[in-house]
Amino acid sequence: LSEEADDTDSELGSMKPLHTFCAMKADDGPCKAMIRSYFFNMYTHQCEEFIYGGCEGNENRFDTLEECKKTCIPGYEKTAVKAASGAERPDFCFLEEDPGLCRGYMKRYLYNNQTKQCERFVYGGCLGNRNNFETLDECKKICENPVHSPSPVNEVQMSDYVTDGNTVTDRSTVNNIVVPQSPKVPRRRDYRGRPWCLQPADSGLCKASERRFYYNSATGKCHRFNYTGCGGNNNNFTTRRRCLRSCKTGLIKNKSKGVVK
């Protein structure tokens, strides 16, 4: 059996954050937007993703993983330089691929100690180990030695979720719900709200059946759909009220455009 090193590696035990706010808990705030942000997790001594609501919260919130690491991880920039110069890599770079307990099919990258390169793998969405990076770039910076690797090909950044075959973006039906494709659909300039409110309902890639709501820009209303539990997009709200609060405000009420209020 492949036994993984613990997430609580001993080398990390004595680390102290650079700033007091790095010790604060992730705070999504009272608002209901869904903004991908990062915070420093005192328990794992890593910067991790969380969903920020868009207002209030605290200082332990960063727009990028890199910014979080630079701000809160002692010696991070030195470590990155070390890795780039072919010196020591963090121990977790040598952990074997671990897809984790769940099956959510997320595209991630890991450092392969056999090939000495960062490679794509499919992460299940929960647990796993720390040899797991959201971007190829981040994996290369931390674990790969660029001196020995070929020039990176500019890779198109796919969505976070791996799908089987081609993804249909403009769906006319999702979970048997007809998404109206009518002339009443507001053009982008008629909608000043959050861009994900214009996305079609996306049931995702797992097998659960969870009641969610999506904003239908054609009707200006929030409709129910079944979410499978992972994947999908940000036009996905746990209640109709949250959906309306998040998306309805961006609609410009212009009768001549035929947009339903």
């Epitope: 059996l1 492949s2 036994e3 993984e4 613990d6 997430d7 808990k25 992730a26 999504d28 869904m34 991908r36 915070f39 997790n41 005192m42 328990y43 794992t44 993703e49 969380f50 969903i51 671990d98 897809p99 307990l101 769940c102 099956r103 299940g124 969405g125 929960c126 647990l127 797992c206 097998k207 659960a208 969870e210 969610r212 979410y227 539990g229 992972c230 999908g232 940000n234 996905n236 709200f237 746990t238």
Partner: antibody
Amino acid sequence: EVQLQQSGPGLVKPSQTLSLTCAISGDSVSSDSAAWSWIRQSPSRGLEWLGIIYYRSKWYNRYAVSVKSRITINPDTSKNQFSLQLNSVTPEDTAVYYCARWHSDKHWGFDDWGQGTLVTVSS
Amino acid sequence: DIVMTQSPLSLPVTPGEPASISCRSSQSLLFRFGINYLNWYLQKPGQSPQLLIYKGSNRASGVPDRFSGSGSGTDFTLKISRVEAEDVGVYYCQQYTSYPLTFGQGTKVEIK
């Protein structure tokens, strides 16, 4: 319907090895949509997760740090079961031991449990 | 380890009345898209635990709709809209954001 049937001795002497087996029906130990765990329960510790194994093209395991040096969880694909071995037991290991299935596809939780085995560590 | 703290530890209830149990985690269990890595279990007297709620707010198969889970981040609530006699037992929350998987200490629900 998935069923987990536990077997093994209810009394173990201190310093010896606790061995329990969990026989699976209605699923496969090498299914890539499940993981198999041991959890114990005692009045002093409550529910305590001990470890888990799962198959995703190869076998993986994870153990709780509190028992890591003493625990082994192994699959037996021929008998469709998995086992727990806990070495060098002390009276603090006295507990009800449960095997459980982690549903990796839908629930992302322990959705099936064995009947529990009370193991007493005493000389 | 992520510490899960439940309150109250004991909850006397009247059949037909609502009941509410709180669970607080020492770090955020929010993943994304409103998914929280938190489950609720019920252990009826003399039985093994059973899964009630997964991912914070989704009822497991066969669980009556009087049970509902809510909350996000570090604060979660399990509600029973109208308690029935068969709902007695110990309720546990459990996180799976990081290893080791950890459970709350349990809330014992009993009929007054």
